[in-house]
């Protein structure tokens, strides 16, 4: 079932840097913003990086890696938990291989791979494994008990062989942003909804504020207006009906917002805000009860 | 090569307990969840039961929920189905099967084993 | 619980067909939906998961489409080894839950 939806009173967010949400497909026109949005288009656009892409970083614990290829170093970060995020346009795959391990097996030490579809814990074999992610986003978390230990990555891109996303989809990086709903527009299609998909630091949460109007009041079957809210670790989702602030914080660094296919035919809007918090609780938590919300 | 071997099957009277194995070779079994998914003779498919890799998480049908229980032994490459109180519906073939994930709530089964039959009748 | 509907429940066509399932979902689940192929006596074999993406080793001749709560299978050119039934499946939320399948059988 779905949660209740969480709401508070309206009162104005510290304003964040804005994004500005584009659908996938379409031509890219930047607002200023601190935040980064990607498209499918070949060659993205991008903005001066922000704070969670600054190339000089004591540590690659923490991080969220925008380019097409790189290399990240987990191997004696100084801290027995290390993650970092890996973020591509949608329609994107995010491939991943082992250059080099020193992890201990048998103490519990292991690597930790999730997404949107992904959920993996792995160890053993991982010299020179190649792991290829089924979305366009990737968080790596490694636990490593041992001073020194680790493992080498090197990351990648290539086009997905199949498209897991609507023309529609969006998709957010960066600390904080704009949300604005999708639009019908007679040129593309909506049959099944859209979503925009929020991806920050993998040591922060999300918090989403906004305003839905227009919602009009279908609230059942096709024509059903409505907005999901799921957040990608835990799997819990809140349902938003009807004209209304919504107020809703993550559990992990990655969330996924769907528009209903009434929520568009209707015209309704949705527009504010997301912003990070700082994470209570890492994500995946210890191993041993690396358990999440199982419910929905 | 992935390899799935269901075994414990068997007739037995209502009321009554049964324990399912399964075998798991051909790939890391600790790194990934496993389910039990069911079929009633020329019916549809059910799924049973899921648990995490470590056995962190499990989750059960509403119709089994109380009477069997899912575990997992990660040393022995095994899974196991504990079903108590049977009933004449839990007459079903077994099936057990791999998920491509570590969480069982990725809910998908990317292997499967042959299955194994399970009667419940006095 | 998820209600999953499938239609047809049965079909009979030619090798060379092209073949159409669909399968909806009694509320939005997202893009997480598989399809999965049996063939008599047989275990159930996956095709599609999260509603597009063919499974390794799965010909081309499958395809999946469709998010929110209207999936379809297709089938580009049937082939004698397609004869089977097929099954979607949500994988949005526990308890996960099956369609009642659709028969393909030989016209």
């Known amino acids: 079932g779905q949660g209740t939806p969480s709401l508070v009173p309206h009162e104005e967010a510290a304003a964040p840097g804005r994004t500005t949400a584009t659908p996938a497909g379409a031509s890219l026109e930047w607002s200023q913003a601190r935040g980064l949005l990607f498209s499918p288009a070949p060659q993205p656009r991008r903005l001066l990086p922000g704070p969670q892409e600054n190339s000089v970083q004591s540590s690659a614990c923490g991080r969220q890696h925008l380019e097409p290829t790189g290399t990240i170093d987990m191997r004696g970060p100084g801290q027995a938990d290390c993650a970092v995020a890996i973020g591509r346009p949608l329609g994107e795959v995010v491939t991943l291989r082992v250059l080099e391990s020193s992890l201990n097996c048998s103490a519990g030490d292991m690597l930790l791979l999730w997404g949107r579809l992904t959920w993996r814990k792995m160890c053993r074999k991982l010299l020179d494994m190649t792991f290829s992610s089924k979305t366009n986003t990737l968080v790596v978390r490694q636990r490593c008990g041992r001073p020194g230990g680790g493992v080498l990555l090197r990351y990648g891109s290539q086009l997905a062989p199949e498209t897991f996303y609507r023309e529609c989809d969006m998709q957010l990086f960066g600390p904080w942003g704009e949300i604005v709903s999708p639009s019908l527009s007679p040129a593309t299609s909506n049959a099944g909804g859209c979503r925009l998909f929020i991806n920050v630091a993998p040591h922060a949460r999300i918090a989403i504020h906004a305003l839905a109007t227009n919602m009009g009041a279908g609230t059942e079957g096709a024509n059903a207006s409505y907005i999901l809210i799921r957040d990608t670790h835990s799997l819990r989702t809140t349902a938003f009906h009807g004209q209304q602030v919504l107020y809703w914080e993550s559990e992990s660094s990655q969330a996924e917002m769907e528009f209903s296919e009434g929520f568009l035919k209707a015209q309704a809007s949705l527009r504010g805000q997301y912003w990070t918090l700082q994470s209570w609780v890492p994500e995946m938590q210890d191993p041993q009860s690396w358990k999440g919300k199982e419910g929905t | 090569e992935v390899q799935l071997l269901e075994s414990g099957g068997g007739l037995v009277q209502p009321g009554r307990s049964l324990r399912l194995s399964c075998a798991a070779s051909g790939f890391i079994f600790d790194d990934y969840a496993m389910h039990w998914v069911r079929q009633a003779p020329g019916k549809g498919l059910e799924w049973v039961s899921g648990i995490s890799w470590n056995s962190g998480s499990i989750g059960y049908a509403d119709s089994v929920k109380g009477r069997f229980t899912i575990s997992r032994d990660n040393a022995k490459n095994s899974l196991y189905l504990q079903m108590n109180s049977l009933r004449a519906e839990d007459t079903a073939l077994y099936y057990c099967?791999?998920?491509?994930?570590?969480?069982?709530?990725?809910?998908?089964?990317?292997?499967w084993g042959q299955g194994t039959l399970v009667t419940v009748s006095s | 619980e998820l209600q999953m509907t499938q239609s047809p429940s049965s079909l009979s066509a030619s090798v060379g067909d092209r073949v159409t399932i669909t399968c909806r979902a009694s509320q939005s689940i997202s893009s997480y939906l598989n399809w999965y192929q049996q063939k008599p006596g047989k275990a159930p074999k996956l095709l599609i998961y999260?509603?597009?993406s063919l499974e390794s080793g799965v010909p081309s001749r499958f395809s999946g489409s469709g998010s929110g709560t209207d999936f379809t299978l297709t089938i580009s050119s049937l082939q004698p080894e397609d004869f089977a039934s097929y099954y979607c499946?949500?994988?949005?939320?526990?308890?996960?839950?099956f369609g009642p399948g659709t028969k393909v059988d030989i016209k």
């Open positions: 499946q949500q994988s949005y939320s526990t308890p996960f839950t």
């Open positions: 999260a509603a597009s």
């Open positions: 099967a791999k998920d491509p994930n570590s969480l069982y709530r990725s809910g998908s089964f990317d292997y």
